[in-house]
Amino acid sequence: MASAGMQILGVVLTLLGWVNGLVSCALPMWKVTAFIGNSIVVAQVVWEGLWMSCVVQSTGQMQCKVYDSLLALPQDLQAARALCVIALLVALFGLLVYLAGAKCTTCVEEKDSKARLVLTSGIVFVISGVLTLIPVCWTAHAIIRDFYNPLVAEAQKRELGASLYLGWAASGLLLLGGGLLCCTCPSGGSQGPSHYMARYSTSAPAISRGPSEYPTKNYV
């Protein structure tokens, strides 16, 4: 029962992580203009994302421009885009694997196979979390490096945008949810005691018969 509860918690966390990841990837708030010192040239905020950049005027008016050419984009941006999309697809695949092995589904009947599928889904979610973490940390590293580089102009410096925080949250939720799903399925956790005997007892025979194979006529 506790195992089922952990499974549900794990999958809820991963779903929240996936939604966070999707929002993080989509929002143009990876890099935000940093106004440092007393040199504000214009009262506007620039947001930069993976797919577009937006300029927010002091009046509140916002203009967004989708990046034109894929080939003209910096390689790190292309890589971040790819990793974001891959991470989301991997998490979706993890969800499908989980659904196939969930306790409340009938896709797979055998408990052993169900446990393996849940474990696999947990691993897939963990992979998705790591994939989400890479572009977020890479972008954060670049922003911080620029911030402390004395030769980078103040106007070129950026701050960590909301998308990065969402990305970290998404990664954390995917890692945590995936980890929980892995923990709900220790080897043999969903199996009967006879399996434990066969696996861990040195005196157990090489081939142990299931209870249905023993003759019952001699038993009262």
């Epitope: 007393n38 040199s39 040239v41 980078v152 102009a153 106007a155 070129q156």
Partner: antibody, heavy 119, light 107 residues
Framework: EVKLVESGGGLVKPGGSLKLSCAAS????????MSWVRQTPAKRLEWVVT????????YYPDSVKGRFTISRDNARNTLYLQMSSLRSEDTAMYYC????????????WGQGTLVTVST | DIQMTQSPASLSASVGETVTITCRAS??????LAWYQQKQGKSPQLLVY???LLVDGVPSRFSGSRSGTQFSLKINSLQSEDVARYYC?????????FGSGTKLEIK
């Protein structure tokens, strides 16, 4: 108009010391990163040192670390470069440079002051 | 340290021609590259920063480009006032280093 005037250059013996000054005008001195870059007789450019707008952070290449010290007096709008243990390879034209709010790199250069290290 | 290899060391071209100066970084520097122009007897001047962005007041015949660790400064329709030494410089990490320079002359 941004104006950077270097002074203090001259002839010095190896192992000697020299202090360069850069008088800045035409801008808010305490808002900008300042640097020194030198140009050797062979016309090669070499970054020497950079100091943050407030003076709290300084950046040196290994070639001058421990021998050169950059400082600034924001009240006097002046940048300094204290050079000690001078070597013949330090012979160069030394330029005082101001950073910019919009542009990366070394945006505004002074006219330079010549330092000759020779016996 | 990151080495900047600039080529050619010198070049001669006619007015109206297009010339290209290249600079190769010994390792990745992203787009942290600037180009400077130094006319005879003058101090260097910043032309291009972030590998492709032109400083205000620099004629549009100048353009910068990047391909991996190779950077180029292109001068379209060369003018007599473009006679100068050109330097590339990276500012990716300390120490910041310059290319050896290219001396551009008019035929």
């Amino acid at each position: 108009e941004v104006k950077l005037v270097e002074s203090g250059g001259g002839l010095v013996k190896p192992g000697g010391s020299l202090k360069l000054s850069c008088a800045a005008s035409g801008f808010t001195f305490n808002s900008y990163t300042m640097s020194w870059v030198r140009q050797t007789p062979a016309k090669r450019l070499e970054w020497v040192v950079t100091i943050s707008s407030g003076g709290g952070r300084t950046y040196y290449p290994d070639s001058v670390k421990g021998r050169f010290t950059i400082s600034r007096d924001n009240a006097r709008n002046t940048l300094y470069l204290q050079m000690s243990s001078l070597r013949s390879e330090d012979t160069a034209m030394y330029y005082c440079i101001r950073g910019d709010y919009r542009y990366d790199g070394f945006a505004y250069w002074g006219q330079g002051t010549l330092v000759t290290v020779s016996t | 340290d990151i080495q900047m290899t600039q080529s050619p060391a010198s070049l001669s071209a006619s007015v109206g021609e297009t010339v290209t100066i290249t600079c190769r970084a010994s390792e990745n520097i992203d787009s942290y590259l600037a180009w400077y122009q130094q006319k005879q007897g003058k101090s260097p001047q910043l032309l291009v920063y972030a590998s492709t962005l032109l400083v205000d007041g620099v004629p549009s015949r100048f353009s910068g480009s990047r391909s991996g660790t190779q950077f180029s400064l292109k001068i379209n329709s060369l003018q007599s006032e473009d006679v100068a030494r050109y330097y590339c410089q990276h500012y990716y990490s300390i120490p910041y280093t310059f290319g050896s320079g290219t001396k551009l002359e008019i035929k």
